[in-house]
């Protein structure tokens, strides 16, 4: 339904509070370096303009598209060229090219200072002094650091952030109440950002078809009682929502997400028996709850898949008539029967089935040709099962930190050209699969582990894309979305790599390490480990482990010393010399 004024339409649908929050998120995700005050000023100007359009949809400029309005507003920023360089050239373009240009300049790893959490009393004072500014600042800081964060979900995080301060700033022990809540929000926020980044990468790098295939598989696992037509409708709507959010159309995205939640709740009887509780919640909680809802029980007595997809004489006829619909039905039927498979595995099976039909439906005897297609699935299923079994055993043996270290060594040897901070960040996240998924029973391990690994490897892909340094990473990231994990798993040690020259500065440590949190200290040690492997890629696991133990002994000794800085200087030189002698650095 066409509206005379798109901006008035969205303002009325969303309400002023959500409208302002979403415009702030949109602007912060585009102009990630701009100061908070500048963004607030732009948002206020847009909001005032929207109000004039609500009052009179025929007023001047009210008929312009949101991209035109927002792009024009962003292009008024005086310091655009100094701050953003070539991004300023976007402003010379017309829509829709201008928006595409802004999107291409989103930075997954912006050069912004780490967010340091102030003292609890300082935060509570700021919260009480000006709650609105305090919450806007939260939206701004998260959005600029996570330019693909799912905007309507960020509104949900902000609501929980506000609730935490409202409750805890009145508590007897403010810190005990607030800090665990903030830690939880931070960890959940990072996970949410990474999951959404994969959705946007799927859409932007592999197209709508790839995203829809992912959505069919996931929704079919989640709603196995729903008919194929129902799942297809949900997939179409969900694809629209994510296409909008990934494209910077945050107002449309939030509006359409609310409509989708409303539709799901109005039709829950034909979708899932697990939605009841979600549908009783307010909008933001409802949408979040639906997105996280557990899989419904599988219908009893589902027939064998072979009848329709292998044994039937009409397979090629049905495939030829509507290829994507037929493949969608295959994926739907397979996924609803297999909540124990990862989505990426289901997509690999569907791809194998498609390839087989493409080949066999052109053969002399198609049925004879595709009769054994399900046998081809066996190795595809066993590969992730075996990998998860091995890695969970290793995780249980080593614990999270040492499991991360094993992965750090493994991945640094595979792709040593990748920057050390990226290798540390990605390997630490890969290592978290252990505590996240290995506790689950067999039936839940694969969907947990492999789909999580897809999210983490996408982080590697988007960070690497910004500054490509490894052909092997580029190849694994771009060839096939669903085969990224197997591609990385299959990489062996890079024999072409020329070891990095030794630089003593890399292995110089100071007394500040003693006051770091356990996590930060681990990151320092893991950074040293990556550098060590880059210098000595042929070092054995045992040698690396032993050198890292020497490093731990050195840090522990110097952190207990009276003159810590002198100890780090003197003993650090000895440690480097000893490691050089032992490893021949």
């Amino acid at each position: 339904d066409a509206h005379k004024s798109e901006v008035a339409h969205r303002f009325k649908d969303l309400g002023e509070e959500n409208f302002k929050a979403l415009v702030l998120i949109a602007f912060a995700q585009y102009l990630q370096q701009c100061p908070f005050e500048d963004h607030v000023k732009l948002v206020n100007e847009v909001t005032e303009f929207a109000k004039t359009c609500v009052a009179d949809e025929s007023a001047e400029n009210c008929d312009k598209s949101l991209h035109t309005l927002f792009g024009d507003k962003l292009c008024t920023v005086a310091t655009l060229r100094e701050t953003y360089g070539e991004m300023a050239d976007c402003c010379a373009k017309q829509e829709p090219e201008r928006n595409e240009c802004f999107l291409q300049h989103k930075d997954d790893n912006p050069n912004l200072p780490r967010l340091v959490r102030p003292e609890v009393d300082v935060m509570c004072t700021a919260f009480h002094d000006n709650e609105e500014t305090f919450l806007k600042k939260y939206l701004y800081e998260i959005a600029r650091r996570h330019p693909y964060f799912y905007a309507p979900e960020l509104l949900f995080f902000a609501k929980r952030y506000k609730a935490a301060f409202t409750e805890c700033c009145q508590a007897a022990d403010k810190a005990a109440c607030l800090l665990p809540k903030l830690d939880e929000l931070r960890d959940e926020g990072k996970a949410s950002s990474a999951k959404q980044r994969l959705k946007c990468a799927s859409l932007q790098k592999f197209g709508e078809r790839a995203f829809k295939a992912w959505a069919v598989a996931r929704l079919s696992q989640r709603f196995p009682k729903a008919e194929f037509a129902e799942v297809s409708k949900l997939v179409t709507d969900l694809t629209k929502v994510h296409t909008e959010c990934c494209h910077g159309d945050l107002l449309e995205c939030a509006d359409d997400r609310a409509d989708l939640a409303k539709y799901i709740c109005e039709n829950q009887d034909s979708i899932s028996s697990k939605l009841k509780e979600c549908c009783e919640k307010p909008l933001l909680e409802k949408s979040h709850c639906i997105a996280e809802v557990e899989n419904d029980e599988m219908p009893a007595d589902l027939p064998s898949l072979a009848a329709d997809f292998v044994e039937s004489k009409d397979v090629c006829k049905n495939y030829a008539e509507a290829k994507d619909v037929f493949l969608g039905m295959f994926l739907y039927e397979y996924a609803r029967r297999h909540p124990d498979y990862s989505v990426v595995l289901l997509l690999r099976l569907a791809k194998t089935y498609e390839t087989t039909l493409e080949k066999c439906c052109a053969a002399a005897d198609p049925h004879e040709c595709y009769a054994k297609v399900f046998d081809e699935f066996k190795p595809l299923v066993e590969e992730p099962q075996n990998l998860i079994k091995q890695n969970c055993e290793l995780f249980e043996q080593l614990g999270e930190y040492k499991f991360q270290n094993a992965l750090l060594v493994r991945y640094t040897k595979k792709v040593p050209q990748v920057s050390t901070p990226t290798l540390v960040e990605v390997s630490r996240n890969l290592g978290k699969v252990g505590s996240k998924c290995c506790k689950h029973p067999e039936a839940k391990r694969m969907p947990c582990a492999e789909d999580y690994l897809s999210v983490v490897l996408n982080q590697l892909c988007v960070l690497h894309e910004k500054t490509p340094v490894s052909d092997r990473v580029t190849k694994c990231c771009t060839e096939s979305l669903v085969n990224r994990r197997p591609c990385f798993s299959a990489l062996e040690v890079d024999e072409t790599y020329v070891p990095k020259e030794f630089n003593a500065e890399t292995f110089t440590f100071h007394a500040d390490i003693c006051t770091l949190s356990e996590k930060e200290r681990q990151i320092k040690k893991q950074t040293a480990l990556v550098e060590l492997v880059k210098h000595k890629p042929k070092a054995t696991k045992e040698q690396l482990k032993a050198v890292m133990d020497d490093f731990a002994a050195f840090v522990e000794k110097c952190c207990k010393a009276d003159d810590k800085e002198t100890c780090f200087a003197e003993e650090g030189k000895k440690l480097v010399a000893a490691s050089q002698a032992a490893l021949g650095l």
């Epitope: 032993a546 133990d549 002994a553 522990e556 032992a582």
Partner: nanobody, 124 residues
Framework: QVQLVESGGGLVQAGDSLRLSCAAS????????MGWFRQAPGKEREFVAR????????YYADSVKGRFTASRDNAKNTVYLQMNSLKPEDTAVYYC?????????????????WGQGTQVTVSS
């Protein structure tokens, strides 16, 4: 299973020297740091020295620094503790231990395999 056997302890005068040996068998000796600890009657077991996997890095307790020297011969799967200028307060049972996979390098809990100990007595 790792076996550690200490030898070389005995009764000496203050100011004398002793050399303790610890022979290892079992898992790859050269992959792990080794530690020397001691325990005097009625006291906790305390750290004396740590020598790293390759023998290139040693750490000592302040009380023995400059007097004791740890070394190792990976070809012989043996670690040594050369003790000079011995004092009566060095009297204790001396243990060698092989480093575990976690825990402190200066605490007995960070070491996985232990010898049976050898008595060192320093008379004044």
């Amino acid at each position: 299973q790792v076996q550690l056997v200490e030898s070389g302890g005995g009764l000496v005068q203050a100011g004398d020297s002793l050399r303790l040996s610890c022979a290892a068998s079992g898992r790859t000796f050269s992959d792990y740091a080794m530690g020397w600890f001691r325990q005097a009657p009625g006291k906790e077991r305390e750290f004396v020295a740590r020598i790293n996997w390759s023998g290139t890095l040693t750490y000592y307790a302040d009380s023995v620094k400059g007097r004791f020297t740890a070394s190792r011969d990976n070809a012989k799967n043996t670690v040594y503790l050369q003790m000079n200028s011995l004092k009566p307060e060095d009297t204790a049972v001396y243990y060698c231990a092989q480093r575990g996979d976690s825990g402190s390098n200066y605490d007995p809990s960070g070491y996985r395999y232990w010898g049976q100990g050898t008595q060192v007595t320093v008379s004044s």
